[in-house]
């Protein structure tokens, strides 16, 4: 009942080419520590698409301010969509480990697709 | 282990509105949608709409849309339905209802409340 | 909508012998996750629904095994193994692969 929980409400968006998609994620508790990672696809060969942590991700925003204390919301929102964004984008909880962090719980995944832009 | 209360029943006139509580107690209430479910006499289950309060916002059945306002208060674990516009065809029973389907895919809809009897009559 | 489809609308059985329902969706439940969003729940006479199957085929905390669901993309069923008396009420299978909708429901009645 306590243990963190990712929740991904939506199991499918659908976005006309051109917009912005959201993408809801939240935690249901601050405890274990570690980053936040978005990813598209599952497995070995999944794309990382956002990185709490580090990197530079020009097309993602977070909706709310992941530098708030106590903030439990890593919804993310993709600008300019286009079909090649098309795919399953799961939220992944890592819990702070050394050297690496480790995967500690993943969202169910939220299928994005992407419609042609209305004429 | 998690109950949900759901406040008394109602006698409402037609165009009025109605607004039921849903109070959960004995567990985690945040990040469980609520959903809510109602039943008219004889009939089957018309799911309305549903809120987790983590996040705040609705969503709501079309057929609902417009009529129907889904909140949460997290400080009382509370969730309210209000039904607006009533009409005869709204007299049922409506129920709350603990629905893991919105994040937890451990669960479907795995906690109901007692439900609320809603009369619309002139 | 996706729109839930139950058969039969009636069912009268015979006490220890099996039932079946059956649940049609107008899409598929079946989610790139590999889970079918589809939930089958008992609503007794005058009491609350419950539930008894998530995800297609995972019996609920507290239901017995002669319950079990199986099924996958829009074509699912709900077994009862022996049937046994308190098992009376209306089943409803629903879909929460997108805002959730209920079937008809079945009423198992005792023959």
């Known amino acids: 009942e306590d243990e963190l929980q990712v929740i991904q409400p939506e199991k499918s968006v659908s976005v006309a080419a051109g917009e912005s998609a959201t993408l809801r994620c939240a935690m249901t508790s601050l405890i274990p520590v570690g980053p936040i990672m978005w990813f598209r696809g599952a497995g070995a060969g999944r794309e990382l698409i956002y990185n709490q942590k580090e990197g530079h991700f020009p097309r993602v925003t977070t909706v709310s301010e992941l530098t708030k204390r106590n903030n439990l919301d890593f919804s993310i929102s993709i600008s300019n969509i286009t079909p090649a964004d098309a795919g399953t984008y799961y939220c992944v909880k890592f819990r702070k480990g050394s050297p690496d962090d480790v995967e500690f719980k993943s969202g169910a995944g939220t299928e994005l697709s992407v419609r042609a832009k209305p004429s | 282990q998690v109950q949900l209360v759901q406040s008394g029943a109602e006698v409402k006139k037609p165009g009025s509105s109605v607004k039921v509580s849903c109070k959960a107690s004995?567990?985690?209430?945040?990040?469980?949608?609520i959903s809510w479910v109602r039943q008219a006499p004889g009939q089957g289950l018309e799911w309305m709409g549903g809120?987790?309060?983590?996040?705040?916002?609705?969503n709501y059945a079309q057929k609902f849309q417009g009529r129907v306002t889904i909140t949460a208060d997290e400080s009382t674990s509370t969730a309210y339905m209000e039904l607006s516009s009533l009409r005869s065809e709204d007299t049922a029973v409506y129920y709350c209802?603990?629905?893991?389907?919105?994040?937890?895919?451990?669960?479907?809809?795995?906690?109901w409340g007692q439900g609320t009897t809603v009369t619309v009559s002139s | 909508d996706i729109v839930m489809t139950q058969s039969p609308l009636s069912l009268p059985v015979t006490p220890g012998e099996p039932a079946s329902i059956s649940c049609r969706s107008s899409q598929s439940l079946l989610h790139s996750n590999g889970y079918n969003y589809l939930d089958w729940y008992l609503q007794k006479p005058g009491q609350s629904p419950q539930l008894l199957i998530y995800?297609?085929?995972n019996r609920a905390s507290g239901v017995p095994d002669r319950f079990s669901g199986s099924g996958s993309g829009t074509d699912f069923t709900l077994k009862i193994s022996r049937v046994e008396a308190e098992d009376v009420g209306v089943y409803y299978c629903?879909?929460?692969?997108?805002?959730?909708?209920f079937g008809g429901g079945t009423k198992v009645e005792i023959k």
């Open positions: 809120i987790i309060p983590i996040f705040g916002t609705a």
């Open positions: 995800l297609g085929s």
């Open positions: 629903m879909q929460a692969r997108g805002l959730p909708t």
């Open positions: 209802a603990r629905d893991g389907s919105a994040g937890r895919q451990e669960h479907g809809m795995d906690v």
């Open positions: 004995g567990g985690t209430f945040s990040s469980y949608a």
